[in-house]
């Protein structure tokens, strides 16, 4: 277990021309707040999976009013850190989304209005327990400067927060085979207390005798990769005859969703659908009102004036979930053509095209030969997204620029000797053979297998292959 901490240093206009207009005005004073969303692994940061590692909202920043005619300065920020607690092991690689939100404090009917100013995303490697990492990200004309770190909560230590530390039993040194717990030199690494056989790569424990699995692994010892099982009964007994790997308890067994949330399995983990008034990975966050800005992605918050009354998020098109935190999977309609890979970036769909195709939806079949010349009389042949040159005799290579060695393939049969010639190759046949490639034996009586030798050529003479 541990905490991911994010410190926002500044949010303001980025360098270069085209400074953004101030988001606040004398008529519409406003204040900023931030949201961070963390996901494990180096997944596409835009892929709209839940914030499986956790999410956090900052406090509101000081009220800011634009000075007329002045350029937008760095805007006043909320105090304190954004903290995202994680219960399990720190994954080491993670994706983040940091959103900068504006709360307008004018005379809006129904309270303040929220709008998304900027969203930055990235993928990083980070060891728990390390120093603060500094980062700068740009979103349009805005620039966000921030630092982040992951730290373990005692007694956990290590780069993944999976090792446990205990106070020393003896003042001088740790017990046999146990190391001091850096940086807590006055503590000792606890002995391994996981269940016997628990995978050291894919399992960990927080209590003696348990074996808890990292994401993507299952089974009592975390040795079975999570995959679609071919078993008829997904949790039935293992069959030695079918060689069927049976996963351990399902991610929804025991319902990890708190406060009446309903659990549904996803390919790699689980997802909680929370009742109104609750959110978070396991519906553990409660007492939220509209003043807390619980509706993401431009959702409109209604009701929820005090912690005891539920709020409702009215989501804009394309978003869903009790807090508008989930994106509708638009890629399931397969808008990319010609086998292109679809990516939903939120503000737009993007297609990664296969070789030979281009365009926003991979709709353009590239003319492979356009602008490509084959040298030395070669002709261009299209196919499979790559151009190919059919070369004239005596030339080779991708663009027919290399002079081919016609003898490289040893074309002369029966020991004939090959000579390169401007028009191709010439075979000097060994005694007893003739033909352009010395392929015909000469019969002992002097007659060849051919009806007749061409005039002027005797058996054994070099045969020119034209």
């Amino acid at each position: 277990a541990g905490v991911f901490e994010l410190q926002i240093h500044s949010f303001g206009p980025g360098p270069g021309p085209g400074a953004p207009r101030s988001p606040c005005s004398a008529r519409l004073p406003c204040r900023l707040f931030f949201r961070v969303c963390l996901k494990p692994g180096l997944s596409e940061e835009a892929a709209e999976s839940p914030c499986a590692l956790g999410a956090a909202l900052s406090a509101r920043g000081p009220v800011y009013t634009e000075q007329p005619g002045a350029p937008a300065p760095d805007l006043p920020l909320p105090d304190g850190l954004l903290q995202v607690p994680f219960r399990d092991a720190w994954p080491g690689t993670f994706s983040f989304i940091i959103e900068t939100w504006r709360e307008e404090l004018g005379d809006q009917i129904g309270g303040p209005a929220w709008s998304l100013l900027a969203r930055v995303a990235g993928r990083r490697r980070l060891a728990a327990g390390g120093p603060w990492a500094r980062d700068i990200q740009r979103a349009g004309a805005w620039e966000l400067r921030f630092s982040y770190r992951a730290r373990c909560e005692p007694p956990a230590v290590g780069t993944a927060c999976t090792r446990l530390c205990r106070p020393r039993s003896a003042p001088s040194r740790c017990g046999p085979g146990l190391r001091p717990c850096a940086p807590l030199e006055d503590e000792c690494e606890a002995p391994l207390v996981c269940r016997a056989g628990c995978s050291p790569e894919h399992g960990f424990c927080e209590q003696p005798g348990e074996c808890r699995c990292l994401e993507g692994w299952t089974g009592p010892l975390c040795t079975v990769p999570v995959s679609t099982s071919s078993c008829l009964s997904p949790r039935g007994p293992s069959s030695a005859t079918t060689g069927c790997l049976v996963p351990g308890p399902g991610p929804c067994d025991g319902n990890p969703c708190a406060n009446g949330g309903s659990c549904s399995e996803t390919p790699r983990s689980f997802e909680c659908t929370c009742p109104r008034g609750f959110y978070g990975l396991r519906c553990e966050v409660s007492g939220v009102t509209c003043a807390d800005g619980p509706c993401f992605n431009g959702g409109l918050c209604v009701g929820g004036a005090d912690p005891d009354s539920a709020y409702i998020c009215h989501c804009p098109p394309g978003f869903q979930g009790s807090n508008c935190e989930k994106r509708v999977d638009r890629c399931s309609l397969q808008p990319c053509r010609n086998g292109g890979l679809c990516l939903d970036l939120g503000h737009a769909l993007r297609c990664r095209c296969r070789a030979g195709f281009a365009g926003p939806r991979c709709e353009h079949d590239l003319d492979d030969c356009a602008g490509r010349a084959c040298a030395n009389g070669g002709t261009c042949v299209e196919g499979g997204g790559a151009h190919r040159c059919s070369c004239a005799l005596g030339f080779g290579g991708r663009d027919c620029r290399e002079r081919a060695d016609p003898c490289a393939a040893r074309p002369c049969a029966h020991g004939g000797r090959c000579y390169a010639h401007f028009s191709g190759l010439v075979c000097a046949c060994a005694p007893g053979y003739m033909g352009a490639r010395c392929e015909f034996p000469v019969h002992p009586d002097g007659a060849s297998a051919l009806p007749a030798a061409p005039p002027g050529l005797r058996p054994g003479d070099p045969q020119r292959y034209l």
């Epitope: 394309g318 638009r330 309609l333 397969q334 808008p335 990319c336 053509r337 010609n338 292109g340 737009a348 769909l349 926003p360 939806r361 991979c362 709709e363």
Partner: nanobody, 119 residues
Framework: EVQLVESGGGEVQPGGSLRLSCAAS????????IGWYRQAPGKQRDMVAG???????TYAESVKGRFTISRDNAKNTVYLQMSSLRAEDTAVYYC?????????????WGQGTLVTVKP
Amino acid sequence: EVQLVESGGGEVQPGGSLRLSCAASGSDFSINAIGWYRQAPGKQRDMVAGFTGDGVTTYAESVKGRFTISRDNAKNTVYLQMSSLRAEDTAVYYCAADVKIGGDYEWFWGQGTLVTVKP
């Protein structure tokens, strides 16, 4: 701007049939991909059936063999013929389209039409 207008929803008994229509209107646009999504109360909005960018039909596993999508290009309309309806098909059905306007592509949603399956 492209408008998608759904119609044809209503209440039907299990085993019954309904035909939904989605008409696209606007100026100077061409449809790249179009289809139907549905959202039951408290659930996610999921794709039901559609025409992909390549013009191929695609269906969710849960509706294969029961639902059929078709289109009338002249009318810029897509249809969803739903038969052997079940209680779990109850949802708001949304038309969705990936549309080319000028040189850019934009995604549009309809307002939705409610389909209720109950005895």
